[in-house]
Amino acid sequence: MMTGTIETTGNISAEKGGSIILQCHLSSTTAQVTQVNWEQQDQLLAICNADLGWHISPSFKDRVAPGPGLGLTLQSLTVNDTGEYFCIYHTYPDGTYTGRIFLEVLESSVAEHGARFQIP
C-alpha cells in the first residue's frame, strides 16, 4: 500500500525574465527514493538519480539549474513556460509518486506565490 504524500510548491507565479524554484517533498513513507524526474507536460526537463546524480535535458541545459536538493530552478522565464510541471518520485518498494505544480509566468511585476497543497 502506498502511504506517501507529495507536498509541492503548488500554484506559483513569477515574472518574465526571472527565475523560480520548483520543489516537491515526499513524506509519510519509508520507501527509498531512487530517482526523481522533472517534466513539463510531456517533456523531460531533468532527472536526479540516487547513484548517477543529475542529468539535464539538452533542450533545457541553458535554463535549468539543479537544486536546492531535489528541486529544480528555472531561469530566464518566458510566457511560454506557463503550464504544468510534474515531479515524479520513483521509489522502492512503493512505486511512483507524482506531484503537480502550476506555473504562471507574468508580464507584469505582480507575481505572487500560491499556497502549498498536498497530493496523496
Epitope: 513524506s27 548517477l52 543529475w54 535549468v64 539549474a65 539543479p66 537544486g67 536546492p68 536538493g69 530552478t73
Partner: antibody
C-alpha cells in the same frame, strides 16, 4: 568513490585576489553541484554558493556575491573559487563539498587562506 | 535567511552517557533538507545524519536523529571516545543554505 583534492594554503596581501582549486575524481564531475563553505572560529560554517559544472549555473549567498566567483573546468574536473579585494575578514578555511543524493556528502580537506596587511 | 540555533553550545559527557543536542530553525524546514555533520579538530565535516533521521553510510548505530518543522535533534545513545567532536546542523530547504553554530561535545 568520490574524492576532492583542494589546493594548498595561501598567504596573500590585503587588497589582492586569490583563486583556489578543488579537483574532483571518482565520479562524473558534470552531474553534481559543487558547493563552497567558509569556516572561521568566529562565524562557524558559512555557505558561499554552488556551481553546477554541467552548465556552469551558479547560486550565491548574497553575503558573498561581490566577494566570491565560482567557476568550473570540465576538462580537468576542477572547480575554482576566486576571492577578490581581500581583507582580514577573508582569512579562513575554505571547503569545497560535493552535493550527494540529499546532503553534502563529500568534502575536500580545506584550503587555509591567510590575509596579511 | 533561515537561522539555525543550536543548543547547548558546549556539552560534557561521560563514556556511555546518553546525550541529545537540538537545532531550532527560525522558520519551518522540511525534514528532507535537515542534516547533521560531525567535525573533529583539524578535519573536514562528515555527514552523520541526512533527511533529519537517516544515518549516513558508515555512521555507528548509537547516533540517531529526529524532528520536524522548526526543531531537530541529534541523540547519541551511549557516548564513545570517538564521538568527541563538534556537531553542526544544516538546512538546504532554501537559499542561502545555512548552518548552526555547532555543539561541541567534550568527554569528561
Amino acid at each position: 568513490q568520490a574524492y576532492l583534492q583542494q589546493s594548498g594554503a595561501e598567504l596573500v596581501r590585503s587588497g589582492a585576489s586569490v583563486k583556489m582549486s578543488c579537483k574532483a575524481s571518482g565520479y562524473t564531475f558534470t552531474s553534481y553541484n559543487m558547493h563552497w563553505v567558509k569556516q572561521t572560529p568566529g562565524q562557524g560554517l558559512e555557505w558561499i554558493g554552488k556551481i553546477f559544472p554541467g552548465n556552469g549555473f551558479t547560486d550565491y549567498n548574497q553575503k558573498f556575491r561581490d566577494k566570491a566567483t565560482l567557476t568550473a573546468d570540465t576538462s580537468s574536473s576542477t572547480a575554482y573559487m576566486q576571492i577578490s579585494s581581500l581583507t582580514s575578514e577573508d582569512s579562513a578555511v575554505y571547503f569545497c563539498t560535493r552535493e550527494g543524493w540529499l546532503s553534502l556528502g563529500y568534502w575536500g580537506q580545506g584550503t587555509t587562506l591567510t590575509v596579511s596587511s | 535567511d533561515i537561522v539555525l540555533t543550536q543548543s547547548p553550545a558546549i556539552m560534557a559527557a561521560s563514556l556511555g552517557q546518553k546525550v541529545t543536542m537540538t537545532c531550532s530553525a527560525s522558520s519551518s524546514v522540511n525534514s528532507t533538507y535537515f542534516h547533521w555533520y560531525q567535525q573533529k579538530s583539524g578535519a573536514s565535516p562528515k555527514t552523520m545524519i541526512h533527511r533529519s533521521s537517516n544515518l549516513a553510510s558508515g555512521v555507528p548505530a548509537h547516533f540517531s536523529g529526529s524532528g520536524s518543522g522548526t526543531s531537530d535533534s541529534l541523540t547519541i545513545s551511549s557516548v564513545e571516545a570517538d564521538d568527541d567532536a563538534t556537531y553542526y546542523c544544516h538546512q538546504w530547504s532554501g537559499y542561502p543554505f545555512t548552518f548552526g553554530a555547532g555543539t561541541k561535545l567534550e568527554l569528561k
